[in-house]
Amino acid sequence: SIPWNLERIIPAWQQTEEDSSPDGSSQVEVYLLDTSIQSGHREIEGRVTITDFNSVPEEDGTRFHRQASKCDSHGTHLAGVVSGRDAGVAKGTSLHSLRVLNCQGKGTVSGTLIGLEFIRKSQLIQPSGPLVVLLPLAGGYSRILNTACQRLARTGVVLVAAAGNFRDDACLYSPASAPEVITVGATNAQDQPVTLGTLGTNFGRCVDLFAPGKDIIGASSDCSTCYMSQSGTSQAAAHVAGIVAMMLNRDPALTLAELRQRLILFSTKDVINMAWFPEDQRVLTPNRVATLPPSTQETGGQLLCRTVWSAHSGPTRTATATARCAPEEELLSCSSFSRSGRRRGDRIEAIGGQQVCKALNAFGGEGVYAVARCCLLPRVNCSIHNTPAARAGPQTPVHCHQKDHVLTGCSFHWEVENLRAQQQPLLRSRHQPGQCVGHQEASVHASCCHAPGLECKIKEHGIAGPAEQVTVACEAGWTLTGCNVLPGASLPLGAYSVDNVCVARIRDAGRADRTSEEATVAAAICCRSRPSAKASWVHQ
Amino acid sequence: QDEDGDYEELMLALPSQEDSLVDEASHVATATFRRCSKEAWRLPGTYVVVLMEETQRLQVEQTAHRLQTWAARRGYVIKVLHVFYDLFPGFLVKMSSDLLGLALKLPHVEYIEEDSLVFAQ
């Protein structure tokens, strides 16, 4: 009889009827920026502090009647989902509410900014344990709201935001589009995207993961023991805020980057039917539903990686797309993808002291995406080995020549548009282990990294017959760091990583009589961290 | 991410006859004006003036005061609703959109964003 949403996100072995800590206390504090709330509700009483913060616009309409229970409805429900005694995720967590939404559920960017500043001030005046900020609201894209979220995140605060209920690209809304925010889309009891009237959950590359957001039972402000079902990406975000609070309660030293990576790693994969999303957004939208990860004591030390997509470059001939990792993360590889196949490849370059992944559009191309593989690895040190495009002569292999450095990724780009050049084999582990091999007209970039106990290997999978994509997965215990397409007789559209799977996309030429040398191959670089071992390249 | 802005970013030039009135602000505006792409969500008349990241607290207050002074000379009353400095340097101001060109020429200004609505999700 546990509500379906709690069953979904908290594995049975981690569930207790009781508060998350024996005395119901928690060192984590959650700040909720929403409507006013009914703090006396049995579900949340004694756990909620209503701050004196209030920054809301006037309600619309002269005949608007402020009914307390309606004014408190949204916020009370969310407070219950985060920390409610029975229907809450993080049952022992204390919550502070800031009123930034009026009785109609409307607020302003400026009011939200002042609310975020209030939290920062509180943090400075009275430093406490870990802070989680829940933003169950969305407006149009706002550079300043995103900046404020970024600055607050840099102080160690974890921000969780609703992706938005507009059945649209979450990148067009704020704070959902802020890279430092954990952005949450909504799924239903069948793990499918939530439909809300004619609209529904937002999607796209700015969504980090999905969580339950349909028919969620929680505290109703109608009375102190009333409950009701509500739906939306706010409810989904509240689940993730609760999970984050539980994670921080167990491991208070977890950073934002670690939290995000662990949420991604332990989420339930490939249960969402992607057909609900617009076709061009399917590849960008994460197919994962949040679950509470085990504690770091049980799973510490492993290499954690995630895929970060850039915005679309646009179609101009010189257009580029840039994907960035979070400051704590290391960029271990860079690839690119174009639906038309017209691209000039990808490379890692330094911008403002940070390594970024850049993809280059080609003449006649409809635009490209850069795809960064962003990883967390203690004491990692990476460098890029470049070989400029050879004017003539054989393919030039690029390997990691520094001692104890291993290959984690390969990038290739062409200074001139030569689609034929892209159809040549680029990387062959069975011939040259641990080397990037580029066509003579391509510049080759090898990403070489050193970290204690880091070992890597190339794993390939080829299909000789007609195919639109070829995949290869790293086995259990190994993490995908690099992904390339080794094209046969087909035009490669590019390659990208989906969790631990390397996906090579091609425009198939339709020839079924290819030899194995002409086969399209997905080549994955799989790494693992064994802190006791030395860095090494594993020969297959 | 910033490159996503499905966003209106406008460079507002000051009318030439105004230039003579702008003593200290006679340099060309390099700051940009931004507003929500969804017209129904815009709140014209309220603006967040965002200053360069390194701007000191005192400079934020001076900039806001300077804008009030310049506006008053032109017969406009503006109201500084809030001054930001804990997360970013800037201030929230209620003023006529006529003054945007002037505000964009203020020293330290990086961009000005028109206020807009957010909604419970």
Epitope: E17, R42, A87, M228 | -
Partner: antibody, heavy 118, light 107 residues
């Protein structure tokens, strides 16, 4: 597992008082409100009142305000109800029940049968 | 005080039948209604909470519905062990109030 233990029966004289106990185990006593319910023989259920064990806050049915007093002892995880000035009308089974906010009164004691007789 | 009225004190039914018990609140109580079963000589047992949610371990032949003032408790296929008195209770406000109870008799 959750248990609420109540003594089986109490025999009291008219005009006297009685203090009924309800010992909770298997959960954090201070996390959930405790309710008391009266049931006269062959009759329905009548709500007396509730107490929050964490802070001692109480709510009473107006009808029982001068009859019942609810208290708790956190150290022994026990809830008490004192009934005063007993008459034959007070002869009934008295149940304690834990209320979880969402699930209502999910665990009940076995009830204490109070007989008021001279 | 909110009055909860169960219009039938007794209901007679046969094994395998579908039976519905109604409960009417004197004012809007949202969905803050619970249903309890009390078998002879036992303490009450929670079956349904928040008007329509089945409590842990309760067989799925028991269902609840309604909101506002009108609530229904249904047993889709009565079993011999369902012989009991069924009470509705409002949790909307204090004092909490119970319906008078409906005794289910098996023919």
């Amino acid at each position: 597992q959750v248990q609420l233990q109540q003594p089986g029966a109490e025999l009291v004289k008219p005009g006297a008082s009685v203090k009924l106990s309800c010992k909770a185990s298997g959960y954090t006593f201070t996390s959930y409100w405790m309710h008391w319910v009266k049931q006269r023989p062959g009759q329905g259920l009548e709500w007396i009142g509730e107490i929050n064990p964490s802070n001692g806050r109480t709510n009473y049915n107006e009808k029982f305000k001068s009859k019942a007093t609810l208290t708790v002892d956190k150290s022994s995880s026990t809830a008490y109800m004192q009934l005063s000035s007993l008459t034959s009308e007070d002869s009934a089974v008295y149940y304690c029940a834990r209320e979880r906010p969402l699930y209502a009164m999910d665990y009940w004691g076995q009830g204490t049968s109070v007989t008021v007789s001279s | 005080d909110i009055v909860m009225t169960q219009s039938h004190k007794f209901m007679s039914t046969s094994v395998g039948d579908r039976v519905s018990i109604t409960c009417k609140a004197s004012q809007d109580v949202s969905t803050a209604v619970a249903w309890y079963q009390q078998k002879p000589g036992q303490s009450p047992k929670l079956l349904i909470y928040s008007a329509s949610y089945r409590y842990t371990g309760v067989p799925d032949r028991f269902t609840g519905s309604g909101s506002g003032t009108d609530f229904t408790f249904t047993i889709s296929s009565v079993q011999a062990e369902d012989l009991a008195v069924y009470y509705c209770q409002q949790r909307y406000s204090t004092p909490r109030t119970f319906g008078g109870g409906t005794k289910l008799e098996i023919k």
